[in-house]
């Protein structure tokens, strides 16, 4: 069971202190940019964090979603990374959610965060390069201090 | 770096309460869950609940302490407190306060210890 | 009540390779991670390992953490005189709702 709490905005970046974003396409991707070119690509930048009390002792439980015209909430249903548009419910009945993730501090860390499937155990939000893009998908955790899982969230409330 | 400060040493008289403090500094307090462990003298550690100041104040206890112990947190001075009632002689140890920001069971800080001595 | 056994003590030259094993049972380390934390003496306890196998940053890497089935153990090579300490094994227990410890070993580096 998981029971909505309170939101707020963020700005998401992997370690390379790109930004992520959601383009036209509604795909999540993640792209140099200055402060001002993510204050310019706003909302498509800013990401609504909502955090959610967990009936089991797993972490803070959190979706993501952004508001461009509709909302829309990052799902990783079969393994796949993709925003439905959808707001993030009140409560879910469930121990397992395709929208809901685990928001992790890195131990020795602090500011560093990962994001862990609650559907899929041991798979982490990452940023992978495909050919020129950089997509965001679900991964499963293959070797010790993986960067690509590694992301800074910084509050824009 | 957060850091844990606890409060200093106590000497209680048996039935009586003890509460020890445990400030956070240099981090966000309310994302992360705070357990409270013990360790009686030459033994191993015993952990005895946790509050996710976070969840608005959501607490868990062990099934041993329940009934005996109240763990509370105040968000505007970022500290957690742990009350102990009905305090016996087995009751002295060393009460450290952990906090565990990667997953509520992983206690990745922990303060430097608040010894509580129960003698009449 | 310990669910988590431990050896008391293990013992090891320099320079050498010692292991500390954990064992519980399907309600904890069967169903759950496994942490280990590392305490000198006169000290607060420090996390050394996570998830099984994972160490936090400042942890040298000559330690490391494995589990398999209902038990988990924790890998110290190149031992050095400041690994001289007490080592405790943590988990889930599902039965008892509630985290659980080993009892501890004390490792001498002789």
């Known amino acids: 069971y998981f029971g909505k709490l309170e939101s707020k905005l963020s700005v998401i970046r992997n370690l390379n202190d790109q930004v992520l974003f959601i383009d036209q396409g509604n795909r999540p991707l993640f792209e140099d940019m200055t402060d001002s070119d993510c204050r310019d690509n706003a909302p498509r930048t800013i990401f609504i964090i909502s955090m959610y009390k967990d009936s089991q002792p797993r972490g803070m439980a959190v979706t993501i979603s952004v508001k461009c015209e509709k909302i829309s909430t990052l799902s990783c249903e079969n393994k796949i990374i993709s925003f439905k548009e959808m707001n993030p419910p009140d409560n879910i009945k469930d121990t397992k959610s395709d929208i809901i993730f685990f928001q992790r501090s890195v131990p020795g860390h602090d500011n560093k965060m990962q994001f862990e499937s609650s559907s899929y155990e041991g798979y982490f939000l990452a940023c992978e390069k495909e050919r020129d893009l950089f997509k965001l998908i679900l991964k499963k955790e293959d070797e010790l201090g993986d960067r690509s899982i590694m992301f800074t969230v910084q509050n824009e409330d | 770096e957060v850091q844990l400060v606890q409060s200093g040493a106590e000497v209680k008289k048996p039935g009586s309460s003890v509460k020890v403090s445990c400030k956070a500094s240099g981090g966000t307090f309310n994302s992360y869950a705070i357990s409270w462990v013990r360790q009686a003298p030459g033994q191993g550690l015993e952990w005895m609940g946790w509050i996710n100041p976070f969840y608005i104040g959501e607490t868990f206890y062990a099934q041993k302490f329940q009934g005996r112990v109240t763990i509370t947190a105040d968000e505007s001075t970022s500290t957690a407190y742990m009350e102990l009632s009905s305090l016996r002689s087995e009751d002295t140890a060393v009460y450290y306060c952990?906090?565990?920001?990667?997953?509520?069971?992983?206690?990745?800080?922990w303060g430097q210890g608040t010894l509580v001595t129960v003698s009449s | 009540d310990i669910v988590l056994t431990q050896p008391p003590s293990v013992s090891g030259a320099p320079g050498q390779r010692v292991t500390i094993s954990c064992s519980g049972s399907s309600s904890n380390i069967g169903n759950h991670y496994v942490n280990w934390y590392q305490q000198l003496p006169g000290t607060a306890p420090k996390l050394l390992i996570y998830r099984n196998n994972h160490r936090p940053s400042g942890v040298p890497d000559r330690f490391s953490g494995s589990k398999s089935g209902t038990s988990a153990s924790l890998a110290i090579t190149g031992l050095q005189s400041e690994d001289e300490a007490d080592y405790y094994c943590q988990s889930w227990d599902y039965s008892g709702f509630s985290t659980v410890f080993g009892g501890g070993t004390k490792l001498t580096v002789l």
């Open positions: 952990a906090r565990a920001a990667y997953h509520p069971l992983v206690f990745d800080n």
